[in-house]
């Protein structure tokens, strides 16, 4: 690794305020310059004195100054340094900071435990209509409905795994070819990448920390989206994939390994089967086109079961119908024959909380929506203020500076490989994409981690998500084990195929391009985020599924003219940037069009108009419900009472300046101050060091 | 212990009828299948008919339909068998039998047999 | 329907010989075939059902054996009081039919 610059003092004069704004660093450090640093040279630091925090005076910069919205906060240390505390303070310090700790684990815990009982209540709300989706005749010489069912099942059952191993009993089983099953596997990559966009929207009371988080999210969906906007129609032409991965199935006598390591799940589990424990078999039923599964609910009632293999006389018509031959009797009355059938027989009951409710699944499913996405909520929200009181100072030079810092000359362009290797290994480790991913997502918006970092590790969560599945391959039985092992296969090929589209030069890195933008355009309206989650992951695949149900014709019919409307408006945007002469006056820019084809702005007026209801409540609503109200009516005044989105950001609606909330800024002790959150003595009192 | 009592012999004249019973006792009437066999002197058996008592569903062989009809009363757990328009070589021995409802067992239980004579 | 045939239509054994009684099906019946003891003067007594399933309380020394057409019932060692005469019956379609029945005398 680099080395770490020897760090000037962190504040030379306690009296005056030191500025590193969040979300708007006037001066970007030089990355080349920063990286060839040795031990000995002294990092410069720029210090801006400034008043304190409650002068509006201090609110608006000088439209002047061009700020990087991207460019890490620098969250500075108020508290008394280690060496001026006494031995009581040094031992009370010590014990804040483990107390610190073990409540970090602790809601890290639970956010893990959530995004479990998350990914169960989507499957309870949505699971059996996911399973009747995958039975649809179409997907077999439709790659484009099988992808667009990837995502719309996998976003249904919040669980990419779920989704594909319904795809592998369904190839085992010769209900769907590898061919038919690759489209799908992709799709289930898009759908994976919704978890992490909704645990972004809850850091939405923060301008700057919404912009960096819901760009880190998206930074994965865009690869995602991307790769098969490319790979899709190469995969169509040439079954390269398929190819590919059927040789190395070919070629390796593979016998059945062991299970692949429930690593997380053995401490979540214990957890999360006291509130809700599913029977994912019926989901695959549905899909397998077994009419009794319909019936079923998805809540498992019993959890120790005996089965027994019986033989059962049943009547049938006449003796020619007998199963066989010699098992086959008359009473004189009725025509008998022998069944063989698996007689099950309840031993004893799960332990959850829904165990003897007997609720629709519909409603389980509701209640457990509400309750984890309070839960996700509330542990994102203390995680993001403890991880704010820690990472100060030295501790949050020190962090960033090992993550973001690339290796020295000419050896930085591996930190990102390497950092594609560590995703790997987080994601095996915890045995989810989804889960890694969306413990990336706060340290993205708090400012730990940079997007061009989170980059590479999101694409290392994809790889590992696909290892996990190839270990769960190995491990299944004889009959599912070439298919389940070639899909597996095809995941990860297909994830090797987008790196090396969108990763290795830096001018193909699209993604990171694509999500800043989106994180633009989402921090100033902040509905659009919930648009772009509905749009993305729900409107276009069903608008996608509901034309290809129509036909080949009706699709092509709608789609050509809607993607060469798409193409056109790229190419005209690449050309009005790049070289605008080559245009018309009037193409030059995108004025021709009425308001509301090229801006927000109209849009934005209409989502007020419709979310004033919210405004008028919102004040008196809990800090996490008061997240969710903003986001829907980006609103600054009305949470102004609970102080979690308070915004003094009016100013900005006004004129393109950008503006600092208490918040954003540098000390969150001092925004927290000048809010009346804290005493101004506790500033004094804060400890950071561990 | 499992019983099949059946009524006493009959002399009956041709083109009358008989109404022979079958009292059960020591099971399940409704459990079983209760049959008719009759055996003519010095002859084989031959089934008449069965009825199940749970639900009175009956058959009958082809040469008795019309002329024999298979009842079972469950409150009292007895199982009737009327023939009618009886010729002289409806002289036999009819038995009651029963046999286990939905299992291969056959007739596993028979009824001491009422001698019905058809004589003018 | 279905004919079964007994065969011998009787026999005469002595004590502790081995007897065969075969029964023949005029069509298959797979093992839906029972055999029954008739002693004179009594009534009808199941031995064996499903080709080879002794009944309850039936000596070990009656035994059963055949699938599709061909059947038998063996005695392993007669003994005075297997003097009956003995019937198979076919259950594999409607109407159950009897075998003419073979009688078992001792010499």
């Known amino acids: 690794m680099a080395p770490w610059p020897e760090l000037g003092d962190a504040q030379p004069n306690p009296d005056k305020y030191l500025e590193g704004a969040a979300g708007q660093q006037p001066t970007a450090p030089d990355k080349s310059k920063e990286t060839n640093k040795t031990d000995n040279t002294e990092a410069p630091v720029t210090k801006i004195e400034l008043l304190p925090s409650y002068s509006t005076a201090t609110l608006i910069d000088e439209p002047t100054e061009v700020d990087d919205p991207w460019n890490l906060p620098t969250l500075q240390d108020s508290g008394i340094k280690w060496s001026e505390r006494d031995t009581k303070g040094k031992i009370l310090c010590f014990f804040q900071g483990i107390g610190r700790l073990i409540l970090l684990l602790g809601f890290l815990y639970f956010f893990v435990c959530s995004l479990d009982i998350l990914s169960s209540a989507f499957q309870l709300v949505g699971g059996k209509m996911a399973g009747q989706f995958f039975s649809n005749s179409s997907i077999m010489s439709n790659p484009l409905l099988g992808l667009v069912i990837g995502v719309l099942v996998t976003v249904l059952v919040q669980s990419s795994s779920t989704s594909t191993s319904i795809v592998v009993s369904m190839v085992s089983s010769s209900l769907l070819t590898v061919r038919a099953a690759i489209p799908i596997i992709m799709g289930a990559n898009i759908g994976t990448s919704i978890t992490n966009t909704i645990v972004a929207l809850m850091q939405v009371g923060d301008r700057s920390e919404f912009r960096r988080a819901f760009a880190g999210a998206t930074v994965h969906d865009f690869f995602n989206w991307l790769s098969v906007l490319v790979l899709l129609p190469v995969e169509v032409a040439t079954h390269y994939l398929e190819i590919i991965t059927q040789l190395i199935v070919e070629s390796f006598h593979f016998k059945n390994g062991e299970d692949a390591p429930d690593l997380l799940k053995v401490i979540t589990k214990p957890f999360t089967k006291l509130i809700v424990q599913l029977d994912k078999k019926v989901i695959s039923q549905i899909a397998m086109n077994d009419e009794k599964a319909k019936n079923k609910s998805l809540v498992k009632i019993w959890c120790k079961t005996f089965t027994n293999k019986t033989q059962i006389n049943v009547t049938v018509p006449s003796t020619a119908n007998c199963t066989s031959p010699s098992l086959c009797w008359t009473d004189g009355i009725q025509n008998w024959t022998m069944k063989n059938v698996t007689y099950k027989e309840n031993i004893a009951k799960c332990q959850h909380i829904f165990v003897n409710f007997h609720l629709p699944d519909l409603a389980v499913g509701t209640i457990l929506l509400i309750l984890s996405l309070l839960v996700l909520c509330g542990c994102l929200i203390m995680i993001v203020k403890i991880l704010g009181s820690v990472l100060k100072g030295q501790v949050a030079t020190v962090i960033k500076k090992t993550i973001n810092t690339d290796f020295p000359f000419p050896f930085a362009w591996l930190t990102g490989y390497l950092a594609i290797l560590v995703g790997a290994g987080m994601t095996f480790i915890v045995q989810s994409s989804s889960v890694f991913t969306s413990a990336l997502t706060p340290l993205i918006g708090i400012g730990v981690i940079t997007i061009e970092r989170a980059y590479p590790l999101t694409l290392g969560s994809n790889i590992g998500t696909t290892t996990t599945a190839i270990l769960a391959a190995l491990a299944s039985p004889g009959n599912a084990l070439r298919s389940s092992l070639q899909i597996a296969l095809c995941h990860f090929f297909f994830n090797i195929s987008g790196i090396l589209l969108w990763y290795p030069i830096p001018f193909t890195r699209l993604p990171i391009r694509m999500a800043k933008g989106l994180g633009n355009i989402s921090a100033k309206y902040r509905w659009f985020a919930v648009f772009y989650l509905i749009i993305f992951f729900f409107l276009i695949p069903l608008t996608v599924f509901g034309l290809s149900l129509a036909g080949w014709r009706v699709l092509v019919g709608v789609g050509v003219p809607v993607v060469f409307i798409i193409i056109l408006v790229l190419c005209l945007r690449l050309l009005q940037s790049r070289c605008p002469r080559v245009l018309p006056k009037k193409l030059q820019n995108w004025n021709f069009l009425p308001l509301w084809m090229r801006s927000l702005k109209p849009w934005d007026a209409v989502v007020s108009k419709f979310t004033g209801c919210f405004q008028m409540r919102c004040c008196c609503c809990c800090r996490v419900c008061c997240r969710a109200c903003c986001l829907l009516c980006d609103c600054p005044k009305c949470c102004r009472c609970s102080k979690c989105c308070e915004d003094l950001e009016e100013a900005q609606e006004g004129q393109d300046v950008p503006v600092k909330a208490p918040e954003t800024f540098d000390n969150i002790t001092i925004s927290r101050e000048a809010q009346g959150e804290v005493p101004a003595s506790d500033s004094k009192t804060e400890c950071t060091a561990l | 212990q499992v019983q099949l009592v059946q009524s006493g012999a009959e002399v009956k004249k041709p083109g009358s009828s008989v109404k022979v019973s079958c009292k059960t006792s020591?099971?399940?009437?409704?459990?079983?299948?209760i049959h008719w066999v009759r055996q003519a002197p010095g002859q084989g058996l031959e089934w008449i008919g069965g009825i199940i008592p749970n639900n009175d569903v009956t058959n009958y062989k082809q040469n008795f339909r019309g002329r024999v009809t298979l009842t079972a009363d469950k409150s009292t757990s007895t199982a009737y068998m009327e023939l009618s328009s009886l010729r002289s070589e409806d002289t036999a021995v009819y038995y009651c039998?029963?046999?286990?409802?939905?299992?291969?067992?056959?007739?596993?239980?028979w009824g001491q047999g009422t001698t019905v004579t058809v004589s003018s | 329907d279905i004919q079964m045939t007994q065969s011998p239509s009787s026999l005469s054994a002595s004590v502790g010989d081995r007897v065969t009684i075969t029964c023949t099906a005029s069509?298959?019946?797979?093992?839906?075939v029972a055999w029954y003891q008739q002693k004179p003067g009594k009534v009808p007594k199941l031995l064996i059902y499903w080709a080879s399933t002794r009944h309850t309380g039936v000596p070990s020394r009656f035994s059963g054996s055949g699938s599709g057409t061909d059947f038998t019932l063996t005695i392993s060692s007669l003994q005075p009081e297997d003097v009956a005469t003995y019937y198979c019956q076919q259950y594999r379609t409607s109407p159950l039919t009897f075998g003419g029945g073979t009688k078992v005398e001792i010499k």
């Open positions: 039998a029963r046999w286990r409802n939905a299992y291969y067992s056959a007739m596993d239980s």
């Open positions: 069509q298959d019946v797979g093992t839906a």
């Open positions: 020591g099971f399940f009437f409704t459990e079983y299948i």
